[in-house]
Interface confidence: low
């Protein structure tokens, strides 16, 4: 049986004749043979399959819309092609099979010829009919396979005119799409000139909307700028109050000591020599001793050094002689600082701020400090607590705090937990709490686990001031979830 | 008197490190931060972080984050800024400043460090 | 960040007249403001702090003032020597240097 297959485009087809390497490789691939036996010597045809006769190109790819017929046409044309360039190449190999075994007939009929005797004549008659009879047999044989090819063949042409049939009907989905495509597009061309005009229409309104914008902003700013002015103004007013009032004092004074002189003219003292003044000032008490009576800002000397720091100065509460070392009143600074700037403070003295863990720390270490801290609620309330013995340890000891003797009206229990604990900021925990009490609750504190206090959380307005666990708290005397609306931390010489 | 010495010139290959040295004298080591500032040629002066006094804690400016490294030796009086993965853009002269007591402004600096990026 | 805007970015003026220089922040630095002077070739060199102190050693013709986002130095008769760049830098949150600006003598 003669068999046929594609190798990617083309058609192979391999005659093998008594070559056993050839028939070797070939056997490898698995394909069929077709055997003749001639004496000694045998003659093997080795053809390809007929079932994977098949083109290895993709099938009917998305572009091929675009030829003029479908591919299976072309395919089908082509292997027409190489079936009848088979069959002229399967009547040559006959013909030449047929004078190969006439060739080797007459050799051997020759050797008879010159080896036989003459007893041997009915041998040899019987070799030439076996091989005459051999010969119709093979003859016979090729018969039945062109016979067979051009089955194959009628077949084939079968197959291309169902082929044609189903390339016509490709034709006419194609044309169908076609259509329904265009209809699409220009459906789709309608929607475009839609949204392009929509599109317009809200690049106006946006215009429209940040022209708005800029004029609002213009606004703001001239607002701003008016707020600054009036800030300015009003610190001025303050400053001018302050001076006025230094003024009034120094006159006083200066008249005293006039009415001093004159009334002690007869004596023997010296009236040009007057008390000599203290240049630099440990802490708002020793300003307060030098006559300075006005709540303001003052600077302050670093004990034993010539660093300066500026604090404002509480002459009038309590007796005055108050330095304030921690102020919140409108959240106008972030107090969600680092360990360095706790240690030096931030802020404005003015307004809020924090003095800084160092300073108090040192200054502390110098001599006794009460610690007062004064609270006020959103509803108008008022209240304080008071430490009568506080300091700070060094920043070895993470400024652990260290508080005595609880009295005033903000609980009877100390919302600084106690005994003491190391402070912590966002990048320096120190608490006792798995988690990070100064990231969770904001600003830095002495935080317990995290503790019942945190005058440096986030500052909350009215009406939003309340189930806030991250504000501005002092638990013993609004509870937990209250925050504060303002709070000043103060202290004092103990001996003051 | 207060004095910020740095290490000399260095020229480095793009995506190699380098390391700066800052030695402080004049003044107790600890009780000031130390701060990095670098300028590239024609450049504003750029902070690039800061490293504590007594605990070595450090912060760093959003933009070194992921490449520079501050380090002190107190027993030497010095601190280091390590910048890796240089890039050509690294060239610079780097200063060691130091900071305030109380202050936050940087009122001594170093002589700076010409660091060269090139390959 | 806050973001520090400084002008001119550079002027040239006489000997003897007065140079304002503004610093300008994109936020609220309260007074937390200095002033350098930068030679060519050399360190920054600290002249004034908290926007209006004159740092010991200055020559009082340089001066300082504003507070919040505007601020001014302002050198009363220019000299010589004060040929050179001169930087802002607030740090009130954070460190921020202005552009700077490079003053000639005409």
């Known amino acids: 049986m003669w068999q046929i297959v594609f190798f990617t485009l083309s058609c192979d087809l391999v005659l093998a004749a008594a070559y056993n390497n050839f028939r070797k490789s070939m056997d490898s691939i698995g394909k069929k043979q077709y055997q003749v036996q001639h004496g000694s010597c045998s003659y093997t045809f080795l053809l390809p399959e007929m079932d994977n006769c098949r083109s290895s190109s993709s099938p009917y790819v998305s572009n091929a819309v675009q030829r003029d017929a479908p591919l299976e046409y072309d395919d089908s044309v082509q292997r027409l092609q190489v079936l009848e360039n088979i069959m002229e190449n399967n009547t040559q190999w006959l013909m030449k099979l047929e004078n190969y075994i006439q060739d080797n007939m007459k050799k051997e009929m020759v050797e008879i010829q010159q080896n036989a005797v003459q007893n041997q004549t009915a041998v040899m008659i019987e070799i030439g009919t076996n091989l005459l009879n051999q010969t119709a047999e093979q003859t016979r044989k090729l018969t039945d396979v062109e016979a067979q090819v051009l089955n194959q063949t009628t077949r084939l042409e079968l197959q291309l005119l169902e082929h044609s049939l189903s390339t016509n009907k490709l034709e006419k989905q194609i044309l169908d799409q076609t259509s329904e495509i265009n209809k699409l597009q220009d459906k789709n061309s309608f929607l475009e000139k839609k949204v392009l005009a929509m599109e317009d229409k809200h690049i106006i309104q946006l215009q429209s909307i940040k022209e708005e914008k800029d004029q609002l902003q213009v606004l703001v700013s001239k607002q701003n700028s008016i707020i600054e002015e009036l800030e300015k103004k009003i610190v001025t007013a303050t400053v001018n109050n302050s001076v006025l009032q230094k003024q009034q004092h120094d006159l006083m004074e200066t008249v005293n000591n006039l009415l001093t002189m004159m009334s002690t003219s007869n004596s023997a003292k010296d009236p040009t020599v007057a008390k000599e003044e203290q240049i630099s000032f440990r802490d708002c008490a020793e300003v307060f001793k030098s006559g300075h009576t006005t709540n303001g800002i003052y600077t302050l000397t670093f004990p034993n050094s010539t660093e300066e720091i500026k604090a404002y100065c509480d002459m009038e509460a309590g007796g005055g002689g108050w330095t304030i070392i921690q102020r919140r009143e409108d959240g106008s600074v972030d107090f969600q600082r680092t360990w360095k700037e706790y240690k030096v403070g931030f802020g404005n003295p003015s307004g809020e701020y924090w003095l800084g863990n160092e300073f108090v720390s040192q200054l502390t270490n110098q001599q006794r400090y009460v610690l007062k801290i004064h609270l006020k609620d959103w509803e108008g309330n008022e209240a304080y607590s008071l430490y009568e013995h506080f300091y700070l340890s060094s920043e070895e000891l993470n400024y652990r705090i260290h508080l005595k003797g609880l009295t005033g009206t903000a609980g009877k229990i100390s919302s600084i937990s106690q005994p003491g604990n190391d402070f912590s900021t966002k990048d320096g925990d120190n608490d006792k709490c798995i988690c990070k009490c100064s990231q969770m609750l904001t600003g830095g504190w002495w935080f317990d686990a995290c503790g019942p206090s945190n005058l440096n959380g986030m500052y909350y307005p009215q009406r939003q001031n309340t189930n806030k666990f991250n504000g501005i708290k002092w638990y013993y005397w609004k509870g937990s979830g209250y925050s504060l609306k303002a709070t000043t931390m103060m202290i004092r010489p103990a001996d003051f | 008197q207060v004095q910020l010495v740095q290490s000399g010139a260095e020229v480095k290959k793009p995506g190699a490190s380098v390391k700066v040295s800052c030695k402080a004298s004049g003044y107790t080591f600890t009780n000031h931060y130390l701060h990095w500032v670098r300028q590239a040629p024609g450049q504003r002066l750029e902070w690039m972080g800061w490293?504590?006094?007594?605990?070595?804690?450090?912060s760093y400016a959003q933009k070194f984050k992921d490449r520079v490294t501050i380090t002190r030796d107190t027993s030497a009086s010095t601190a280091y800024m390590e910048l890796s993965s240089l890039r050509s853009e690294d060239t610079a002269v780097y200063y060691c400043?130091?900071?305030?007591?109380?202050?936050?402004?940087?009122?001594?600096w170093g002589q700076g460090t010409l660091v060269t990026v090139s390959s | 960040d806050i973001q520090m805007t400084q002008s001119p970015s550079s002027l040239s003026a006489s000997v003897g007249d007065r140079v304002t220089i503004t610093c300008k922040a994109s936020q609220n630095v309260i007074k937390y403001l200095a002033w350098y002077q930068q030679k060519p070739g050399k360190v920054p060199k600290l002249l004034i702090y908290?926007?209006?102190s004159l740092q010991t050693g200055v020559p009082s013709r340089f001066s300082g003032s504003g507070s919040g986002t505007d601020f001014t130095l302002t050198i009363s008769s220019l000299q010589p020597e004060d040929v050179a760049t001169y930087y802002c830098l607030q740090y009130n949150s954070w460190w921020t240097f202005g552009g700077g600006t490079k003053v000639e003598i005409k």
């Open positions: 400043a130091r900071e305030g007591y109380f202050t936050n402004y940087f009122d001594y």
């Open positions: 490293i504590g006094p007594t605990n070595g804690d450090t």
């Open positions: 908290n926007a209006s």
